[in-house]
């Protein structure tokens, strides 16, 4: 393919005389001839077939090799059959010799034959007879030879005639190169083929404008000795904001984006976002819409949710249960959670302050996924405001006013605190006498104490209770030689306090005498 060849010499392209050096001058002569298409061209011919021992040299002008290493010489020639020339058998030949001589510069008009290196003896595949001439059969022979690798700046070609009747119709000298191409968005420059027939020249490509090398896969190709690019390795890909169009990367249009070089095509901006310039790698959010740090560029811009709906409450002394419905607008996100803001407000001016850290929230104060919460350990007879805010992944990015549902309540009387200092006063076979101290914070008048007890190995599956108004009690009707667990709590009008820590007591083993003590006032079956 001609496109792979870089011409250094083409005798057919020259319209004027070639003026090569002929030695002796009576040997090769420059004439006007015809090529295979009968187009007039400058040719050299020799037909010194009468005398033996012919040694006619024809030398080209100096040929600069450029950056070539392997040179190709294509000869087109016509050779006359010796049989068509009467009386020349023995002196007529049907071959000629091809030589070259490397130099760094033009050495002048002298042909120093001994410096020339023989490339080959050239013979015709077909010569023509006089009859062929009459039928105008131009039997043109084409022979290609290689020379190289060459080390100097240029060279001469020489043709030695040894007694043939021959016309050099065309001398073409060229080297092969792989012409610059764009493959996989990488530009591979013009590359001269290697010095050996089998050599491959590895060439690294340069990414086209607005493209980048694929990770750890830089573009490479191999230029073969025949001037052909072999299978590409690696590739370039269009950068963020650009997409491939043929051998180039074009910017994404307005309202389109491409966030990563790994994406193939530009995409239309997601909902509630825009790009007002070409080559965008991401789309900006419209006013009031946001993108969370964890949101990929391809998701729509979103906004904070509206306030929760239908907030209701239930007060049990100093515990408040809150419940609500989801917001009407989740802002376009499905990561809605809730947070509770508790404020304690004064009776006078209605000024409110945050509740502080001694308040309990079940299951938690923030990041609530369910739409209910229980707020505990509030002060009795106090005013509180609870704000319930719906929150999503972009709420913290918004500078607009918070949207929440609020409720104001007043707590009732608080239940007493935990009973402390439980002691076993007396332990018998079937009864145990206990005493304890009043709660540190009765939060009102203690109306009674409730004692819960059960056999330890029953693990509270079945328990009994006993109520008493004093800070001591005797629990009867127990089994001898059995370990019992006891817990006590105080009761006021506001409700039950928390049970005291467990106390383990073992009754005495069975004996002959029986003691009659106070019997348990109540015994209830209460499975855990």
């Amino acid at each position: 393919q001609a496109a792979k060849e870089v011409l250094l010499l083409d005798s057919k392209a020259q319209q004027t005389e070639l003026e090569w050096i002929s030695s002796p001058p009576s040997g090769w002569e420059e004439i006007s001839g015809l090529d295979e298409n009968y187009t007039p061209i400058r040719t050299y011919q020799v037909c010194q077939v009468m005398e033996p021992n012919q040694n006619n040299w024809l030398r080209t002008n100096w040929i600069s090799k450029g950056n070539a290493q392997r040179i190709f010489v294509e000869l087109k020639f016509t050779l006359r059959d010796c049989n068509s020339l009467p009386g020349v058998l023995g002196t007529c030949k049907e071959t000629f010799n091809l030589y070259y001589y490397e130099t760094d510069y033009d050495t002048g008009r002298n042909i120093r034959e001994n410096l020339y290196v023989k490339i080959d003896t050239i013979a015709a595949d077909e010569s023509f007879t006089q009859g062929d001439l009459g039928e105008r059969k131009m039997k043109l022979n084409t022979e290609v030879r290689e020379i190289g690798p060459l080390s100097k700046k240029g060279f001469y070609l020489a043709f030695q005639d040894v007694g043939a009747c021959i016309a050099l119709v065309s001398v073409k000298v060229y080297y092969k190169k792989c012409w610059s191409i764009v493959e996989n968005l990488a530009v591979f420059p013009d590359t001269v083929t290697g010095s050996e027939f089998s050599s491959l020249v590895e060439v690294r490509g340069t990414c086209v404008s607005s493209a980048e090398e694929e990770a750890e896969n830089s573009p490479r190709m191999h230029c073969s000795a025949e001037g052909e690019w072999l299978v590409p390795i690696g590739k370039c890909i269009c950068k963020a904001g650009y997409q491939q169009k043929g051998d180039t990367c074009e910017p994404c249009g307005r309202r389109f984006y491409k966030s990563s070089s790994q994406d193939l095509q530009c995409s239309r901006c997601p909902t509630h976002s825009f790009s007002d310039r070409e080559g965008s790698s991401r789309c900006e959010c419209e006013d009031g819409y946001y993108r969370a740090p964890s949101d990929p560029p391809y998701v729509a811009c979103t906004r904070p949710p509206s306030a929760p709906q239908n907030l209701i409450f239930n007060i049990n002394q100093t515990t408040v249960s809150l419940e609500w419905s989801p917001p009407a607008d989740n802002g376009g996100r499905n990561d809605v959670t809730y947070r509770i803001l508790c404020k304690r407000c004064s009776w006078e001016q209605g000024e409110c302050v945050p509740c502080g850290s001694n308040i309990g929230y079940m299951p938690q104060q923030t990041g609530l996924e369910d739409n209910y919460v229980t707020v505990m350990d509030l002060l009795a007879h106090a005013n509180y405001t609870f704000e319930v805010e719906a929150v999503n992944g972009v709420s913290d990015l918004s500078r607009s006013q918070r949207l929440f549902a609020a409720v104001s309540i007043t707590t009732g009387q608080a239940a007493p605190s935990q009973v402390s200092g439980v002691m076993k006063e007396r332990v018998l076979q079937r009864s145990v006498q206990l005493s304890w101290q009043e709660p540190e914070h009765p939060n009102g008048v203690i109306t009674e104490y409730e004692i819960k007890y059960y056999e330890k190995d029953q693990r509270e599956r079945t328990y009994s209770t006993l109520k008493t108004k004093s800070t001591s009690a005797s629990i009867n009707n127990l089994k001898p030689g059995t370990v019992y667990v006891f817990q006590i709590r105080a009761v006021t009008a506001a409700g039950y306090g928390n049970y005291s820590p467990r106390l383990d007591v073992a009754t005495l083993e069975e004996a002959s005498g029986k003691m009659f003590e106070a019997t348990a006032v109540s015994s209830e079956q209460n499975p855990v």
């Epitope: 009576s26 001839g33 011919q45 010194q48 009468m50 050779l79 009386g87 020349v88 023995g90």
Partner: antibody
Framework: QVQLLQSGAEVKKPGASVKVPCKAS????????MSWVRQAPGQGLEWMGW????????TYAQGFTGRFVFSLDTSVSTAYLQISSLKAEDTAVYYC??????????????WGQGTLVTVSS | EIVLTQSPATLSVSPGERATLSCRAS??????PAWYQQKPGQAPRLLIY???TRATGIPDRFSASGSGTDFTLTISRVEPEDFAVYYC????????FGQGTKVEIK
Amino acid sequence: QVQLLQSGAEVKKPGASVKVPCKASGYTFTSRAMSWVRQAPGQGLEWMGWINTNTGNPTYAQGFTGRFVFSLDTSVSTAYLQISSLKAEDTAVYYCARVRLTVYGDGMDVWGQGTLVTVSS
Amino acid sequence: EIVLTQSPATLSVSPGERATLSCRASQSVSSNPAWYQQKPGQAPRLLIYGLSTRATGIPDRFSASGSGTDFTLTISRVEPEDFAVYYCQQYGPSWTFGQGTKVEIK
């Protein structure tokens, strides 16, 4: 300069012989074949044949075999045409001409001035 | 043997005019015949040989063309010194001449 010099006119009786010389100068005699051409009075040209000046090998055209002989003396760069048993119809101007061989065709590029041979009783 | 027939036998032209001489072969011959010019009392002179190559010193008003069996010698503008007899000659194992065309002043 390249030239071929032939001898002057010859008058011969029928049955006699004549030897026409052609002396070459200005080039290497043995590098080119020599052709002989006959032109009868008022007639066209007739090619008689040629001789390889290197080997002495002659080629004769039809009608010019037997009585016609081409020969050489390379030492003096001279070609000869000898005609024996002359006949009246042999009366003509005889030209020697240097042969121009090329790949694409041949011709005679240098001619002698011609020698008129008259055969008359 | 190949016979070459030239026509016309005589061609009358004025100086400056174009002259076209024909040479027809009895069978297909060499790519182009050689052409000679002969003036009275002179030896023939080679004009054209090979593939329409002009011999040394021949002006470019002389050109030859043709193929197969029909060949032409053209004198683009006839000069006074061009009035002569012109012969075509085919080459090969045996050479033959045409009978000639005389170009004379009109």
